[in-house]
C-alpha cells in the first residue's frame, strides 16, 4: 500500500542533498585551513537532525542550534559584505576582493547555498517529491528557518562599516520583505556597526540615475537611522567596469565614477 | 546480495599494526559509508570510526584517535581498518558495518568479524 | 558522548513470553535508534531503525518505540531462535554509541 504523502507547492529537496552538503563541506575545509578542524560527518549529522522527522512547517532557529555549533567561524567583522537581489554580482566581487565576505563565504553559507531540503514528520526520509514554499504552504520550513537563522547571526556578527549591495533593477531597490529587509537590518548591533554603505547596482546601459534618492533607500535610510546607525549610499553606474576595477585598481580609467 | 567479507584472524604483538579488510560486493560500493566496530571477548560493541569511500574522508571515536585509520579503495570496492601501538585490551574480534552516506538508517550489512588477539 | 543504558542486563523468559527491553540515551537522540540482535560468535542484525521501523525481513513479533531519551524494544511471543544479546545503538551524532547489551536466556 502506497504511504500518503503531503504535497507541498515547492520543489522537492535537490537531489543528491546529502551527498552534496558532505562534498561541499570537504571542499570548503579543505581550501580554509582555520576550518580544517571540522568534522564533515558530523556536521551532516547536525543537519540532518535539524529537519528530518520533523514537520516541515514546524521547523525552528532551535532545531538549527547544533548545526550552528559545529558552523561557529570568525569572520573578520569589518569586512561583511551583505546583498539583497544580487547575489551573483556579490559572489563576483567577494572571488576578487578576497579579503570581503559574503554569508555564502561562510562554511554554513556554503553548504546551503541554492539548495531545497525538507523531511517528513515521524519519518527518517528526505522528501524528494516537494517541500513548503514560503508564501503558498508555510514560512517556518527548513530552508527559510535556516537562513533567517544563519542571516542573523551573521547581521549580529558584524562591525564598523558594514556594506550591502542592492539591485537598482528591482521595483523595490530596498525591499523590506527581503531577508535583508527582514532578518539582517533589524539584527545590525548599533554599538558595534558605525555606518551601513548601500551599493545600487545599475542594470542599464545608459542609465544616470541617482537611485541613491528612490524612496525605497529612503526608507532603508530612516530605519537605520532610528536604530542609531548612520548610512551612506553609492551608485553603481557600470557593475562590469566596477568588477573590472575591483581587480585592477591601477587602471587609468578607474578613477572616473563607476 | 550484499556481502562484506573480512580478512582473517590476527595475531600481534604489543606495540604493533594491525590491518583489517573488509571487502563489499553485491552493492553500489560508493553509495554507502562503512564503520568499524569492536568487540572484546564477552563485551559489548564499540564503535570506532567510518569512512565515506564517494568522499574519501573519515572520522572517528576520539578514544582511538591517533592510533586508527580509516580508508577505503575504490578500485577494489574494499573499506580498511589500521590500528597501531597495540596492547593487550585491543584483543577483540572486528567487525565492519555498512550504512548508508546520509546516515538516515541502521548498519545494515555486517562482515563476519576479524579476530585480532595481542599478545606477546 | 551520549550515553545509552539498557534496562536489564539480563532476563529469563520462556517461549511465547512478551519480553520488554528498555534503553535510555544520556541526551535526546530524537528517533535515531536502531536494535541489534546478536547470537553467539555471530555478527549483528539489524531489527529495527529510526525506533520503530522494522528492517527489511524481519518478523513482526519485534516492534519498537520511543523518541528524545527514551526507546523499548518488545518481543511480542519469544521464540526458540529469539534468545541471544540485543543491543541498543544511537546514530544522532558521533561517536556511534551501544548500550550494554541485554542478554535474553531461557527460562
Known amino acids: 500500500v502506497p504511504r500518503w504523502r503531503q504535497q507541498w507547492s515547492g520543489p522537492g529537496t535537490t537531489k543528491r542533498f546529502p551527498e552534496t552538503v558532505l562534498a561541499r563541506c570537504v571542499k570548503y575545509t579543505e581550501i580554509h585551513p582555520e576550518m580544517r578542524h571540522v568534522d564533515c560527518q558530523s556536521v551532516w549529522d547536525a543537519f540532518k537532525g535539524a529537519f528530518i522527522s520533523k514537520h516541515p512547517c514546524n521547523i525552528t532557529e532551535e532545531d538549527y542550534q547544533p548545526l550552528m555549533k559545529l558552523g561557529t567561524q570568525t569572520v573578520p567583522c569589518n569586512k561583511i559584505l551583505l546583498w539583497s537581489r544580487i547575489k551573483d554580482l556579490a559572489h563576483q566581487f567577494t572571488q576578487v576582493q578576497r579579503d570581503m565576505f559574503t554569508l555564502e563565504d561562510t562554511l554554513l553559507g556554503y553548504l546551503a547555498d541554492d539548495l531545497t531540503w525538507c523531511g517528513e514528520f515521524n519519518t527518517s526520509k528526505i522528501n524528494y517529491q516537494s517541500c513548503p514554499d514560503w508564501r503558498k504552504d508555510c514560512s517556518n520550513n527548513p530552508v527559510s528557518v535556516f537562513w533567517k537563522t544563519v542571516s542573523r547571526r551573521f547581521a549580529e556578527a558584524a562591525c564598523d562599516v558594514v556594506h550591502v549591495m542592492l539591485n537598482g533593477s528591482r521595483s523595490k531597490i530596498f525591499d523590506k520583505n527581503s531577508t535583508f529587509g527582514s532578518v539582517e537590518v533589524h539584527n545590525l548591533q548599533p554599538e558595534k556597526v558605525q555606518t551601513l554603505e548601500a551599493w545600487v547596482i545599475h542594470g542599464g546601459r545608459e542609465d544616470s540615475r541617482d537611485l541613491c534618492q528612490d524612496p525605497t533607500i529612503k526608507e532603508l535610510e530612516s530605519i537605520i537611522s532610528k536604530r542609531n546607525i548612520q548610512f551612506s549610499c553609492k551608485n553603481i553606474y557600470r557593475p562590469d567596469k566596477f568588477l573590472q576595477c575591483v581587480k585592477n585598481p591601477e587602471d587609468s580609467s578607474c578613477t572616473s565614477e563607476i | 546480495q550484499v556481502q562484506l567479507v573480512q580478512s582473517g584472524a590476527e595475531v600481534k604483538k604489543p606495540g604493533s599494526s594491525v590491518k583489517v579488510s573488509c571487502k563489499a560486493s553485491?552493492?553500489?560500493?560508493?553509495?554507502?559509508?562503512f564503520s568499524w566496530v569492536r568487540q572484546a571477548p564477552g563485551q559489548g560493541l564499540e564503535w570506532m570510526g567510518r569512512?565515506?569511500?564517494?568522499?574519501?574522508?573519515?572520522n572517528s571515536a576520539q578514544k582511538f584517535q591517533g592510533r586508527v585509520t580509516i580508508t577505503a579503495d575504490k578500485s577494489t570496492s574494499t573499506a580498511y581498518m589500521d590500528l597501531s601501538s597495540l596492547r593487550s585490551e585491543d584483543t577483540a574480534v572486528y567487525y565492519c558495518?555498512?550504512?548508508?552516506?546520509?546516515?538516515?538508517?541502521?548498519?545494515?550489512?555486517w562482515g563476519q568479524g576479524t579476530l585480532v588477539t595481542v599478545s606477546s | 558522548d551520549i550515553q545509552m543504558t539498557q534496562s536489564p542486563s539480563s532476563l529469563s523468559a520462556s517461549v511465547g513470553d512478551r519480553v520488554t527491553i528498555t534503553c535510555r540515551a544520556s541526551?535526546?537522540?530524537?528517533?535515531?535508534l536502531a536494535w541489534y540482535q546478536q547470537k553467539p560468535e555471530k555478527a549483528p542484525k539489524s531489527l529495527i531503525y529510526?525506533?520503530?521501523s522494522l528492517q527489511s525481513g524481519v518478523p513482526s513479533r519485534f516492534s519498537g518505540s520511543g523518541s528524545g531519551t527514551d526507546f523499548t524494544l518488545t518481543i511480542s511471543s519469544l521464540q526458540p531462535e529469539d534468545f541471544a544479546t540485543y543491543y541498543c545503538?544511537?546514530?544522532?551524532?558521533?561517536?556511534?554509541?551501544f548500550g550494554q547489551g541485554t542478554k535474553v536466556e531461557i527460562k
Open positions: 541526551q535526546g537522540i530524537s528517533s535515531w
Open positions: 545503538q544511537q546514530y544522532n551524532s558521533y561517536p556511534r554509541t
Open positions: 553485491g552493492g553500489t560500493f560508493s553509495s554507502y559509508a
Open positions: 569512512v565515506i569511500p564517494h568522499l574519501g574522508i573519515a
Open positions: 529510526a525506533a520503530s
Open positions: 558495518a555498512r550504512d548508508d552516506i546520509a546516515a538516515l538508517g541502521p548498519f545494515d550489512y
